[in-house]
Interface confidence: medium
């Protein structure tokens, strides 16, 4: 799994006029890292963890970064020309990625009301727009006000790809928390379900970094793909992850099934309780 | 009606000891977005931020003067307090209260005036 | 810290005069940078919020304009009352900072 850097900011606005404030979160490594506090006026971090990224921080450069973003956002956003009355919202997802090899990736995507309409790869600064009407014409829009925007040239893509980077590695860097090493807590449980059949399910919990392999074993060789069901491996708000999977099995035959677990080097498995 | 008012004890000795409150009403600190914060003026002089305190009890602090100062509410009385340990002559100005809701300063108090001396 | 840095330090007009007063901040503040009024002996008072945005109660005389680090107030039309010293103020970035003021005086 890359290391990664995502910052998600939204501005709105109502019957043509665009609103002052604007939404902002950032992920790192897929966890809820910071948010823009609209009413503090401040970056926020999202839980202990985040805090000890960085340490007893003011959180000033991610403050100023965020809010220079929000208002390049709402510069755009008055550049769209067929808005309605009503409520629109105007979001940009910006990703950036440091791979196991060192390599790098950069992108970002424009969504109006939703929609996405403009991606862009920071690093070729190649566009892409989907096929539809609607997205053409508000990529066109957009487009031509970037490209009109002095401060959006090649330099400007250019420094948003090394910027998102540099964060990323100040983060890798200064913290502790993204270089451990914690190990799963596995929970294996079983349900009823159809006559002669239970399902077993396998949770995996509080692990980092996310990589994992958590699969179901009969008789010591894994099942295949298409009878197990995997949950997500989703942030659990600690700064650590959860994921699971699941099989059904004959009654009576508990015995023969175990839940093999990989991580960071170890491995282990776990029974179905009887 | 929007109001605050600040007290304090008017003179003190160097190395004492500031305690001020900020009595307000026409809002309460328990609402979300709402926070009270000290500015301090010396006379003639230019506006200082001193310390904020949010409806959540989060505390912000001037860095140049957090060893130095705790700010802290009573939201059922409508009041705000700040201490500041240590005074010196340099200390001696007026102190503000005001009311601070989207990033800034709406509504002030009279202020109340602070002569450190020996 | 962000520096707010204010010029003039001192402007005297004479009444009708369109008068503006500079603040710089030392690093780029978006649009959060917020003015205040203060006449003697009294508190300060808010006149524009976020640059550009104007205060409910205040003189539509009273209008301001810039992002980044280089922001503007300017008085359309100076009145006597209007004496007094302007602070701008850094919504943005922790510490909150002010300006040191510009002081207007009627000739």
């Known amino acids: 799994e890359p290391h990664s850097l995502r910052y998600n900011l939204t501005v709105l606005s109502w019957d043509g006029s665009v609103q002052s404030g604007f939404l902002a979160e950032v992920h790192l490594d897929g966890q809820p890292f910071l948010r823009y506090d609209r009413q503090k006026c401040r970056a926020k971090p999202q839980g202990q963890w985040a805090e000890d990224v960085l340490g007893n921080k003011t959180w000033d450069r991610e403050t100023r970064d965020l809010t220079g973003n929000g208002k390049d956002l709402r510069m755009t956003l008055a550049h769209i020309k067929d808005q309605k009355e009503g409520l629109h919202s105007l979001q940009e997802i910006r990703v950036c990625e440091i791979h196991e090899d060192n390599s790098t990736r950069s992108s970002q995507h424009f969504y109006y009301d939703g929609e996405l309409f403009l991606s862009q790869n920071l690093e070729t600064e190649e566009w892409t727009v989907p096929q539809s009407s609607r997205a053409q014409t508000l990529a066109m829009n957009v487009r031509n006000f970037l490209k009109e925007d002095a401060m959006k040239t090649k330099t400007h893509y250019h420094a948003m790809h090394a910027d998102c980077l540099q964060e990323l590695r100040r983060y890798l860097e200064s913290s502790v928390v993204l270089r451990r090493t914690v190990p799963p807590m596995v929970n294996v449980t079983r349900s009823e379900a159809s006559e002669g059949n239970i399902t077993v399910t396998c949770r995996a919990s509080s692990f980092y970094p996310r990589n994992i392999i958590l699969t179901w074993r009969q008789d010591g060789v894994s099942l295949s793909h298409d009878t197990q069901q995997w949950g997500d491996v989703l942030p659990d708000g600690n700064g650590t992850y959860q994921t699971w999977v699941a099989t059904r099995i004959c009654r009576g035959e508990e015995q023969r099934f175990t839940c093999y677990m990989e991580h960071s080097g170890n491995h282990s498995t776990h029974p179905v309780p009887s | 009606q929007i109001t605050l008012k600040e007290s304090g004890p008017g003179i003190l000795k160097p190395s004492q000891t500031l305690s001020l409150t900020c009595s307000f009403s026409?809002?309460?600190?328990?609402?979300?977005?709402?926070?009270v914060g000290w500015i301090r003026q010396p006379s003639g002089k230019g506006l200082e931020w001193l310390a904020h305190i949010w409806w959540d009890d989060d505390k912000y602090y001037n860095p140049s003067l957090k060893s130095q100062l705790t700010i802290s509410k009573d939201t059922s009385r409508n009041q705000v307090f700040l201490r500041i340990t240590s005074v010196d002559t340099a200390d001696t100005a007026t102190y503000y209260c005001a009311r601070r809701t989207q990033g800034y300063f709406d509504y002030w108090g009279q202020g109340t005036t602070l002569t450190v001396s020996s | 810290d962000i520096v707010m840095t204010q010029s003039p330090a001192t402007l005297s007009v004479t009444p009708g005069d369109r008068v503006s007063l500079s603040c710089r901040a030392s690093?780029?503040?978006?649009?959060?940078l917020h003015w205040y009024q203060q006449k003697s002996h009294e508190s300060p008072r808010l006149l524009i919020k976020y640059a550009s945005q104007s205060i409910s109660g205040i003189p539509s005389r009273f209008s301001g304009s810039g992002s980044g680090s280089d922001f503007t107030l300017s008085i359309n039309s100076v009145e006597p009352e209007d004496v007094g010293v302007y602070y701008c103020q850094n919504g943005h970035s922790f510490p909150w900072t002010f300006g040191g003021g510009t002081k207007l005086e009627i000739k």
């Open positions: 690093q780029s503040i978006s649009d959060y």
């Open positions: 026409g809002f309460s600190l328990s609402t979300s977005g709402m926070g």
